[in-house]
Interface confidence: low
Amino acid sequence: ASVGLPSVSLDLPRLSIQKDILTIKANTTLQITCRGQRDLDWLWPNNQSGSEQRVEVTECSDGLFCKTLTIPKVIGNDTGAYKCFYRETDLASVIYVYVQDYRSPFIASVSDQHGVVYITENKNKTVVIPCLGSISNLNVSLCARYPEKRFVPDGNRISWDSKKGFTIPSYMISYAGMVFCEAKINDESYQSIMYIVVVVGYRIYDVVLSPSHGIELSVGEKLVLNCTARTELNVGIDFNWEYPSSKHQHKKLVNRDLKTQSGSEMKKFLSTLTIDGVTRSDQGLYTCAASSGLMTKKNSTFVRVHEKPFVAFGSGMESLVEATVGERVRIPAKYLGYPPPEIKWYKNGIPLESNHTIKAGHVLTIMEVSERDTGNYTVILTNPISKEKQSHVVSLVVYVPPQIGEKSLISPVDSYQYGTTQTLTCTVYAIPPPHHIHWYWQLEEECANEPSQAVSVTNPYPCEEWRSVEDFQGGNKIEVNKNQFALIEGKNKTVSTLVIQAANVSALYKCEAVNKVGRGERVISFHVTRGPEITLQPDMQPTEQESVSLWCTADRSTFENLTWYKLGPQPLPIHVGELPTPVCKNLDTLWKLNATMFSNSTNDILIMELKNASLQDQGDYVCLAQDRKTKKRHCVVRQLTVLERVAPTITGNLENQTTSIGESIEVSCTASGNPPPQIMWFKDNETLVEDSGIVLKDGNRNLTIRRVRKEDEGLYTCQACSVLGCAKVEAFFIIEGAQEKTNLE
């Protein structure tokens, strides 16, 4: 038989016995000659053992590249494959020799008193008991004990082959402690050596690498990789590593078993790969394979080796982040670097510290972003080894959906007298500013609830059909003014005004503002009345502790049953898209008030007096009158605001100043408070008296000293006083230069 593929120029070695199988009797001499075209060698069964001394390999006398193998007095154990081959090649010729020894039909491994067979309990696995035969056509059975069982070849999964041994499914003999082969020759039984049966596990549950991923080092650092295999019991593990630089000088591999808890159904094995000083060539994929013979599992990790410590920003690092108020904002610091850098965040140059609203780490997280979070955020990466720094600026823009200022006054707006010109406003704050503010309208009667209908909180009006203000047929004549931009409370706001040229019909008006992140709307109830009229005496806006009267005047010939009510607190705030319910249709929310009736020649006047008005008196007051003929109720609403009493304060400081004789001094003293304070000026703690050179204007707010003289030098005090106290500011005016004598002197 030939083994290996012949090369172009070399023929296979030629054997003197041209057979694949040779059968000879025991105690005879085996002699085979092999000829070839270059140096030859022989291999024979058991040629690694002491039996080698019996084997003679000699050079042929009649030619180059020829060797003869001789074994005198062969025994059954010499059965096996005899191979003649060219040195350092795979080219070979093989003959299988059976030495028929009826006294010893099984070939024994030299020095083996017994053998060991390792089996697994896998149903699909077979095991080979290596009881090879010196005779090819023996009747062989397998004996297993204890209890004793005999297995006979069945032509299927149980078989015996003289060159291989006895093959049987492993689970059939897993109970046994030992097995042996038995041959019957002429009613005589011959037994092979005993084989101890060792049941081994094979299952590997998992192979875990630690660190498992993202291993980064710089040149010269130590790499330590642990590979842990978890297996079932009775398993032996063989580890095999693959890595980029296999010929590494400083590589160390240590394999050991790990202790597991007693009673554990699992074994652990550990293999540790150590490279003391990594180089760039050590970068790459490291694979650990654990093999139990029947099963192999592997795991890999990528090791990155950097030339030196470094830090840089990754390509995904954004320069602009946009968010809407209330959202959670996450700005990751995306970097490339080894070792991982220290990360510090700054806002407008000020370091950010983590708290319940902001987390400043690998990711800058703002839990609920607000307008004040808008700004430039700088992230600084510092390499902990090289101290190299990289910085990157991220601009955070926080968008605000349109908010309509007037919406906070969740009250039914005052009624409007028939025929008057009225202005409705929507003051919108949005970032970016609204790209449009549109106005819509619809008739009140198309929308109003019938008194019998229950008022729905979510949509008190059944109507949906809003009309554009350009289409004012059947309604009031309207003009929308160009949007104005105003700085209100330090914020840039857009003010849209709608002018109703003549209040003829009751209607609802809606302003809708839209920007890139949302929309806002406000619905205004525009109730037109020919009925009662409300006036406030003495002032539109009383201050607390002052007295105020609300007068409701109605034509006596048209109206009767005048009554004052106060609108109770709203049951629920009005949500976006909801409409205010007409007051007259929903008297449940009104509180009846005591009032005094007066009459003149044409009108009835119902007066409701508030003595010592307090902040609790603020709100919406309703005057209800009934039409004498139709009995229809007419309502007028007036919102009353009571100003809080505030002690005087002076805004701004008086500055000390130096002035030359003959020049002028102009200073301002702005005071606020409620009631409004009185301003007085003092010089050197004496009341300042106006004369031709000293002028006080704007309620004493502005002081002008014309053509100053040396004697105008001194301490000037501005004092603002009300019933709630006084506030004052002081400044020293220095007058320089010599006083000129005048002719008048």
Epitope: H213, G214, F302, G314, S315, E318, S319, L320, P332
Partner: antibody, heavy 131, light 110 residues
Framework: EVQLVQSGAEVKKPGASVKVSCKAS????????MHWVRQAPGQGLEWMGW????????NYAQKFQGRVTMTRDTSISTAYMELSRLRSDDTAVYYC????????????????????????WGQGTTVTVSS | QAVLTQPRSVSGSPGQSVTISCTGT?????????VSWYQQLPGKAPKLMIH???KRPSGVPDRLSGSKSGNTASLTISGLQSEDEADYYC??????????FGGGTKLTVL
């Protein structure tokens, strides 16, 4: 199957704007960066910018700053590229292309290697600018 | 520099090897290993052939390989076949956090 399907061809006058859409399917739209690349007739490829569909963050090539706007609508897994103040030399095929790079937090230690490259491309949208 | 420098055209006979170079600067190819190569057949969208200098996506034959030395990246196609005839573009990530394409190379199989 991962796919990017772009809107149809457009003919525009100089000074106008064009908005090209790119609908993604077969993967998590918010999980990968999206690039826009254009190719003028007989010319090479030109990178215009990218958008992070997750955050809406963008990064534009210097050449297109101020003229290009990249947006996305995550509800319909669609990216948009709008180019304004069109000139005749904007006549080109415009492609959207998904990046291999998944949107993850780069900064986390022990992160796997990061790969970059545009692995899935749209079929292209021809934009012709002519008076 | 507006684009990475590639030869306008290269050619080779079937079975031969060809190499297309892509030269940048320290600010792009020289700093990052983020170079990709794309093949574009006439009238078609580009197709990713190599990413991260030398990595091949699945489905790309191992006849194509990528490498980098200094400021120059290279694409090598061995065992040239007629279906390799196409335009090839490189692209690199830059220190400006943008991407830059090469001018493109027309590969002709003789």
């Amino acid at each position: 199957e991962v796919q990017l399907v772009q809107s149809g061809a457009e003919v525009k006058k100089p000074g106008a704007s064009v908005k090209v859409s790119c609908k993604a399917s077969g993967y998590t739209f918010t999980g990968y960066y999206m690039h826009w690349v254009r190719q003028a007739p007989g010319q090479g490829l030109e990178w215009m910018g990218w958008i992070n569909p997750n955050s809406g963050g963008t990064n534009y090539a210097q050449k297109f700053q101020g003229r290009v706007t990249m947006t996305r609508d995550t509800s319909i897994s669609t990216a948009y590229m709008e180019l304004s103040r069109l000139r005749s030399d904007d006549t080109a095929v415009y492609y959207c292309a998904r990046d291999l790079q998944g949107i993850t937090i780069f900064g986390v230690a022990n992160s796997p290697p990061y790969y970059y490259g545009m692995d899935v491309w749209g079929q292209g949208t021809t934009v012709t600018v002519s008076s | 520099q507006a684009v990475l420098t590639q030869p306008r055209s290269v050619s080779g006979s079937p079975g031969q090897s060809v190499t297309i170079s892509c030269t940048g600067t320290r600010s792009d190819v020289g700093t990052y290993n983020y170079v990709s190569w794309y093949q574009q057949l006439p009238g078609k969208a580009p197709k990713l052939m190599i990413h991260d200098v030398s990595k091949r996506p699945s489905g790309v034959p191992d006849r194509l390989s990528g490498s980098k030395s200094g400021n120059t990246a290279s694409l090598t196609i061995s065992g040239l076949q007629s279906e390799d005839e196409a335009d090839y573009y490189c692209i690199s990530y830059t220190l400006h956090r943008t991407w830059m394409f090469g001018g493109g190379t027309k590969l002709t199989v003789l």
